[in-house]
């Protein structure tokens, strides 16, 4: 289905515009700010949902350790370009007319520069460390049950194949989530990592992008799981390139 | 194609165990999730728990817990369930199915577990 | 945990009637699923998603509901749909399925 037929709505996609014009008077949602058609059965790409966001009006807003190419997301929010499927465009530019390399999440992997910079391919984000510091508890959650319940909510909520998630680790307080995907392990139709973290990421503060569900709940065993402070480092396959004045 | 073929029919005694396995083909074993369900002589479906065949990561519901024990062999692409402690309460079908994006979207045949002295 | 009740529990139906069985829930759930089980055979999953039909399951089903009522419906009776129906959700652990409606054929 691309969208829920008796009311017309876009179930995976609260930042959008339906109405029953597609064939045959099928329901049919649009993006909000590109106007582009979404495939309601599925998560819609982080680059379509940022250039919603930004056209949205402004109040609607044993531990892994990091490699030393890990980006995260500093730059926060920006309006950008999207391909025809939706995808980041592999440059990114402002209206002042500084540019910027992205990879596939849309993070920035390169200095800033003009409109001479060139980007010449979209680099893909392989792997994603979600890193997560819960609330307080009376005891420690069970491991097993916690990786279970995270895995669970991947697989049923973001619609993630089980296999790309790679590992759940605890230490209390801190969980750290892996995801992995290659360009040669994703297959048509499979939800991209960087989508699913990004609506995790949403849902985590309080701001699900689904439309009618309500927001989440994460119990482990009945007992709360309640986040209050959340980390996304980005790994590339091809390492970002900065220049060392960045790095002081 | 898919396929998920379950273990035979098992007469035991009441107090003893018994392991019953789900040898699946046609599908790379690791990606994917086996989960377990069990079904009475004329009663509905209950769900035991699952077992993530790339981590090994397990849950039981509550009920299970104790009474199964949830392995996979990944070189032999067999899931396996052990039942210990066991009652006439035991005596059902046992289904093993495939979990993926959906919950179960293949399933074993069953295997038949009665106890009886 | 959740609670699925189906109903009826058990029903009947002349092949080309309409049948339309329901499943509620004991709190809100994302979506159902719905399998169909023959006498001697394994659970079939049926639709998916609420209302998405799974590889080679007939047009004349559809399922469709929000929150806590879904329903399961057959446009046409045929006697090959002469089976037990339950639906089942995911939406937290453990998963549960709701008690099953046996559908017979008059």
């Known amino acids: 289905h691309t969208a829920a037929q008796d009311n017309c709505t876009c179930p995976t996609n609260k930042m959008t515009v339906c109405s029953p014009d597609g064939p045959g008077g099928r329901c049919q949602c649009r993006a909000l700010g590109s106007g582009m058609a979404v495939d309601c059965s599925t998560l819609t790409s982080k680059c379509l949902l940022l250039k919603a966001r930004m056209s949205a009006p402004k109040n609607a807003r044993t531990l892994v350790r990091p490699s030393e190419h890990a980006l995260v997301d500093n730059d926060g929010l920006y309006d950008p370009d999207c391909d025809p499927e939706g995808r980041f465009k592999a440059r990114q530019c402002n209206q002042t007319s500084v540019c910027w390399c992205v990879n596939s999440v849309g993070v920035r992997r390169t200095d800033k520069g003009d409109l001479s910079l060139r980007c010449d391919e979209l680099v893909r984000t392989h792997h994603i460390l979600i890193d997560l510091r819960h609330r307080p508890t009376a005891g420690a959650f069970n491991h097993s049950d916690l990786d279970a319940e995270l895995r669970r909510l991947f697989r049923e909520r973001y619609r993630l194949h089980p296999k790309f998630v790679a590992a759940v680790h605890y230490e209390q307080p801190t969980i750290q989530i892996e995801l992995r995907q290659n360009t040669s392990q994703k297959a048509a139709g499979d939800v991209d990592i960087g989508d699913a973290a990004y609506y995790f990421e949403r849902d985590i503060k309080g701001e699900s992008l689904f439309q009618g569900r309500g927001g989440l709940d994460l119990r482990v065993r009945g007992e709360p799981l309640q986040v209050e402070r959340t980390l996304i480092y980005y790994l590339d396959e091809i390492p970002p390139k900065f220049s060392m004045k960045r790095l002081t | 194609q898919v396929q998920l073929q379950q273990s035979g029919p098992e007469l035991v005694k009441p107090g003893a165990s018994v392991k019953m396995s789900c040898k699946a083909s046609?599908?790379?074993?690791?990606?994917?999730?086996i989960g377990w369900v069990k079904q009475r002589t004329g009663q509905g479906l209950e769900w035991i728990g699952e077992i993530y065949l790339g981590s090994g990561t397990i849950y039981y519901t509550e009920k299970f817990k104790g009474k199964a024990t949830l392995t996979a062999d990944t070189s032999s692409n067999t899931a396996y369930m052990q039942l210990s402690s066991l009652t006439s309460e035991d005596s059902a079908v046992y289904f093993c199915?495939?979990?993926?994006?959906?919950?179960?979207?293949?399933w074993g045949q069953g295997t038949t577990l009665t106890v009886s002295s | 945990q959740i609670v699925l009740t189906q109903s009826p529990a058990i029903m009947s139906a002349s092949p080309g009637e309409k049948v339309t069985m329901t499943c509620s829930a004991s709190s809100s759930v994302s979506y159902m699923y719905w399998y169909q089980q023959k006498p001697g055979s394994s659970p079939r999953l049926l639709i998916y998603d609420t209302s998405t039909l799974a590889s080679g399951v007939p047009v004349r089903f559809s399922g469709s509901g929000s929150g806590t009522s879904y329903s399961l419906t057959i446009s046409r009776m045929e006697a090959e749909d002469a089976a037990t129906y339950y639906c089942q959700q995911w939406s937290s652990y453990p998963y549960t399925f709701g008690g099953g409606t046996k559908l017979e054929i008059k």
């Open positions: 199915a495939r979990g993926s994006i959906f919950p179960f979207d293949y």
């Open positions: 046609g599908f790379t074993f690791t990606d994917y999730v």
